[in-house]
Interface confidence: medium
């Protein structure tokens, strides 16, 4: 999906309003120094591409993030403010339902969410600099 035509201000507001709180809750008890930030992004659409990938694409050691509250809110936000986004996700959602796994918060998942926090911050700082 091409995130170029999203309403970035509205996405920023949704992140600051609710998604950030859920991410912080998820990361509670860990420190940024516990993980190395290895993922970055260069502009707003690129940041959203990376955020979508880390949030919704299962990895071998972290398969369950898409069921978390911050992921659900992220999905709703992207569907609301990115034209045509929800249509592109129908097949992906159906495939995910077939792969449902036991929910376990692993260290790898914490690392992934730590990366997400960094990407969201980058997204907003990029947004501020463009105004």
């Amino acid at each position: 999906y091409d995130f170029t035509n999203c309403d970035f201000q509205k996405i920023e507001a949704d992140y600051l309003r609710t998604i950030s709180k859920d991410l912080i809750t998820y990361m509670s008890g860990t420190k940024s120094t516990d993980f190395n930030n290895t993922v970055s992004c260069s502009n707003r659409p690129h940041c959203l591409t990376e955020i979508q990938s880390l949030t919704f694409n299962p990895t071998p050691r972290c398969a369950s993030l898409a069921k978390e509250m911050f992921a659900r809110k992220t999905k709703a936000t992207l569907a609301l403010w990115c034209p045509g986004y929800s249509e592109t996700q129908i097949n992906a959602t159906q495939a995910m339902k077939k792969r449902r796994k036991r929910k376990v918060t692993t260290n790898k998942c914490l690392e992934q969410v730590s990366q997400l926090l960094g990407l969201w911050r980058r997204f907003i700082r990029t947004l501020l600099k463009k105004q």
Partner: nanobody
Framework: EVQLVESGGGLVQAGGSLRLSCAAS??????????IGWFRQAPGKEREGVSC????????YYTDSVKGRFTISSDNAKNTVSLQMNSLKPEDTAVYYC??????????????????WGQGTLVTVSS
């Protein structure tokens, strides 16, 4: 549970001082270098950003109307952020909220439509 609790509000005469405090529970300000700030909402008015502090480097930012009168500071050991308010004016009357992860920088205090994490603390400045 992740929570922010604001305290320190009250009734004060114009020219007086108050110190607001924001205490976090369920997470630690220093853990992820969160940006933390204060917002206020006066009756019948829109919420506005007042001040914020970046835990990355301690940078502080203020909206123009409070510059030179308000001072924000953080105490990571106590997991609190304080707002020292001096030379208070009647127009400072509002409910004050603190918020986290707000991304303050040279562009000023990011003013956004957030759901307050805490109940806020009421500051009333009489003339």
């Amino acid at each position: 549970e992740v929570q922010l609790v604001e305290s320190g509000g009250g009734l004060v005469q114009a020219g007086g001082s108050l110190r607001l405090s924001c205490a976090a529970s369920g997470f630690t300000f220093a853990d992820y270098d969160y940006d933390i700030g204060w917002f206020r909402q006066a009756p019948g008015k829109e919420r506005e950003g007042v001040s914020c502090i970046s835990n990355r480097d301690g940078s502080t930012y203020y909206t123009d109307s409070v510059k030179g009168r308000f001072t924000i500071s953080s105490d990571n050991a106590k997991n609190t952020v304080s707002l020292q308010m001096n030379s208070l004016k009647p127009e400072d009357t509002a409910v004050y909220y603190c918020a986290v992860e707000i991304h303050c920088d040279d562009y000023g205090v990011e003013n956004f439509d957030f759901d307050p994490w805490g109940q806020g603390t009421l500051v009333t400045v009489s003339s």
